[in-house]
Amino acid sequence: SGTTNTVAAYNLTWKSTNFKTILEWEPKPVNQVYTVQISTKSGDWKSKCFYTTDTECDLTDEIVKDVKQTYLARVFSYPAGNVESTGSAGEPLYENSPEFTPYLETNLGQPTIQSFEQVGTKVNVTVEDERTLVRRNNTFLSLRDVFGKDLIYTLYYWKSSSSGKKTAKTNTNEFLIDVDKGENYCFSVQAVIPSRTVNRKSTDSPVECMGQEKGEFREI
């Protein structure tokens, strides 16, 4: 129940990539505004995005405090210009979000191949260690800092002249693979958290090929 001129938010959805986390909902407001609250299961409610006409709220600053916690958010609806108004039950209309555990659920962002270097028949491929918005001791942590060995990378590599993709895996950010001498190869990487049951894989990195400026070739 609520006042006759407000409607409850619905379709509350968490959108999160590399811990950048936004709560989205519907409907677009007509003569109403929204305020969001977030809490952990055992914590107090904290208000964010006060009296907004947006249908999203950036909750990154709250969830990065402890990415392994489970969070719940709720969206309150108020009549525009009369935010003190409450529903018949004595409180504004609100809707709860699904629970959200950032460590288990944030999408893995598209990785980037930082460099590759060929030495003879070996190629060393390095994946950029992307910075997240998770802080420790006033510094931003990388994806590897946050996930540790839970995070692996899968490398796809193939001869420029063929289509079949070989794979290699690493729990660091570096691969050392064997290649055929005199052949040009292309590379793409995918971030994976195997211990998850959903959101296990990132999208593929942009493809990088030998003979382009990102790599380095050394004949030994």
């Epitope: 796809y156 993709k165 070989k166 895996k169 195997p194 049951t197 296990r200 999208t203 593929d204």
Partner: antibody, heavy 120, light 107 residues
């Protein structure tokens, strides 16, 4: 419960074609990789190929390259093995298996298999 | 491609026996080796992963070890349900490859 169910096997003449299906339940195939492995009667296991259903990328054993094609329909949570130009030596039980995708665990769940017989 | 050479191809043993099966990789595969058990008419089942880790639900009489490129599957005390064929497999590089199999039969 994780399950893989193959279907589509049967008797086919040399030079013919067959499409096998691998229907997955209990997990989303785009979060994993799917492999096909075959076993000729009385013989050992032979890896055929894999697909990453998320991007459609594949790799095949030399023995089937150019004749077999692995594909996936993520909306149906199903992988396929299209077999063309079949030969007598392709006669086998064909299994699909899920690749867990870690450094440590590879093929953790297998289907029950479907028999393909190539004979005139 | 990496070859996995498995031995013996078959062995006869009695219930309660200690059984050892070995696999040699043709080049370094780190610990990316799995062992599977297969019974007639059934799909293979994962027993050991990463050379020495027991997969969930597998009895503790099964164990795996690694020494360089040599990998061993040991059944400490053979049970009636263990009579089957066992395969090693490397997944260090593409294509993954299997050993030829070891059939464990009743003596």
């Amino acid at each position: 419960e994780v399950q893989l169910v193959e279907s589509g096997g049967g008797l086919v003449q040399p030079g013919g074609s067959l499409r096998l299906s691998c229907a997955a339940s209990g997990f989303t195939i785009s979060d994993y990789w799917i492999h096909w492995v075959r076993q000729a009667p009385g013989k050992g296991l032979e890896w055929v190929g894999y697909i990453d259903p998320q991007n459609g990328w594949t790799y095949y054993a030399d023995s089937v390259k150019g004749r077999f094609t692995i594909s996936a329909d993520t909306s149906k949570n199903t992988a396929y093995l299209q077999m063309n130009s079949l030969r007598a030596e392709d006669t086998a039980v064909y299994y699909c298996a899920r690749d867990y995708g870690s450094l440590t665990i590879n093929l953790d769940y297998w289907g029950q298999g479907t028999l393909v017989t190539v004979s005139s | 491609d990496i070859q996995m050479t498995q031995s013996p191809s078959s062995l006869s043993a009695s219930v309660g026996d200690r059984v050892t099966i070995t696999c040699r990789a043709s080049q370094d595969v780190n610990t990316a080796v799995a062992w599977y058990q297969q019974k007639p008419g059934k799909a293979p089942k994962l027993l050991i992963y990463s050379a020495s880790f027991l997969y969930s639900g597998v009895p503790s009489r099964f164990s795996g070890s690694r020494s360089g490129t040599d990998f061993t599957l040991t059944i400490s005390s053979l049970q009636p349900e263990d009579f089957a064929t066992y395969y090693c497999q490397q997944h260090y590089t593409t294509p993954p490859t299997f050993g030829q199999g070891t059939k464990v039969e009743i003596k």
